[in-house]
Amino acid sequence: LTCLGGFASPGPVPPSTALRELIEELVNITQNQKAPLCNGSMVWSINLTAGMYCAALESLINVSGCSAIEKTQRMLSGFCPHKVSAGQFSSLHVRDTKIEVAQFVKDLLLHLKKLFREGQFN
C-alpha cells in the first residue's frame, strides 16, 4: 500500500487523499479479517463503473451490526453524500448476484487501487 503514494500528483490533489484513505481502510479490513467478515453476510454485487461509490454504499448499507465495515460505509458516504436521482438508481441496483462481504471488499479494493494508479480520483 505504501507504493500508492508514489502515484499521487505533486502538490495537493484533494480527492486523491480521500481515495487513498478509503483504500487504506479496506486494506485494514482485509488484513485484520480473522472470523468471516460480518459473519459471512451476503450483499449485492455491483458494477465497478460510473456511480461505483454510491452503488457500493447502497450495497454495504444493508449489512447491519457489523462494526468492521461501519467506517467504510461512512467513508463511502463521503464520496456520495447526497442521493442520486431516481433514474440513476435503477442503474445502481442491478440485483442479480449476491456475494460475501469479504469478497465484495476485496473486489472493491482491487478496483480502487487500479483507479488510484490511473489517477482517477473521482
Partner: antibody, heavy 118, light 111 residues
C-alpha cells in the same frame, strides 16, 4: 479536539459578496463530505450547500448560481463564496460534517453571522 | 421539495416527563427499506447536535433516553425521562431528496 470553527461573517450590502471559511481539526477532513447550513434569526434550519470528498458539489435552487462551496484539504478548510447577496440571506451560517444521506450531519461548528442590509 | 412538519411547535414539560415530538413528511422519505430522517437538538446560541440518524439509530454518545421511530411519512422522537439539559429545540431533517429539508422545530420548555 474534534471541531469546526467558522469565520468570515459580517455586515454586507445587498448585491455584495462575502467568503466564509471553516477550519476543521481533530478528524481526517479529506475523507468527509462537508456542508453549510444556515439559520435566519429566530427561524429554523436551511441546507445551503454540500461538497463530497471527491469535490462534487450540491446546492438548493435558492442559492444555485450565487453561492459556491469549495474545500482545501491541505489546509483542512471549507469555504462558501456568497455573491449577489440578498436580505433573505441574513442568517447564522453553520459548517457541518456531512456523513451522507444515511448518517446525517454529525458535527457542527458554532456558526458565523452574516447580515445583509443597506 | 419535501416539507417536514413538526408538532407541536412548542411544549412545556417537567423533569422526568416522557416527551414525544412528531414529524410528518409531505411524501415518503423511505429508501430501499431505510427511513432517511434524522433528529437534531439545538440549545439557545449553540450549534445543532445530531441525536438520531435513519429514524431510529442513536448517534454515538447520545443518552439512551432519546429514541426515534417511524417510517414512510410519520416519525417520532421520544425522550423517555426528560432531564434538565434536554430543554432545547428539536429539529427533524430528511435526506431522501434534494434539497435536504428540516422541520420547523419543536421547543421544549420547562413547565
Amino acid at each position: 479536539e474534534v471541531q469546526l470553527v467558522e469565520s468570515g461573517g459580517g455586515l454586507v450590502q445587498p448585491g455584495g459578496s462575502l467568503r466564509l471559511s471553516c477550519a476543521a481539526s481533530g478528524f481526517t477532513f479529506s475523507s468527509y463530505a462537508m456542508s453549510w447550513v444556515r439559520q435566519a434569526p429566530g427561524k429554523g434550519l436551511e441546507w445551503v450547500a454540500s461538497i463530497s470528498s471527491g469535490d462534487t458539489t450540491y446546492y438548493p435552487d435558492s442559492v444555485k448560481g450565487r453561492f459556491t462551496i469549495s474545500r482545501d484539504n491541505a489546509k483542512n478548510s471549507l469555504y462558501l463564496q456568497m455573491n449577489s447577496l440578498r436580505a433573505e440571506d441574513t442568517a447564522v451560517y453553520y459548517c457541518a460534517r456531512n456523513e451522507g444521506y444515511y448518517f446525517g450531519l454529525t458535527l457542527w461548528g458554532q456558526g458565523t453571522l452574516v447580515t445583509v442590509s443597506s | 421539495d419535501i416539507q417536514m412538519t413538526q408538532s407541536p411547535s412548542s411544549l412545556s414539560a417537567s423533569v422526568g416527563d416522557r416527551v414525544t415530538i412528531t414529524c410528518k413528511a409531505s411524501e415518503s422519505v423511505d429508501h430501499f427499506g431505510w427511513s432517511l430522517v434524522h433528529w437534531y437538538q439545538q440549545k439557545p446560541g449553540k450549534a445543532p447536535k445530531l441525536l438520531i440518524y435513519r429514524a431510529s439509530n442513536l448517534e454515538s454518545g447520545v443518552p439512551s433516553r432519546f429514541s426515534g421511530s417511524g417510517s414512510g411519512t410519520d416519525f417520532t422522537l421520544t425522550i423517555s425521562s426528560l432531564q434538565p439539559e434536554d430543554f432545547a429545540t428539536y429539529y427533524c431533517q430528511q435526506s431522501n431528496e434534494d434539497p435536504w429539508t428540516f422541520g420547523g422545530g419543536t421547543k421544549v420548555e420547562i413547565k
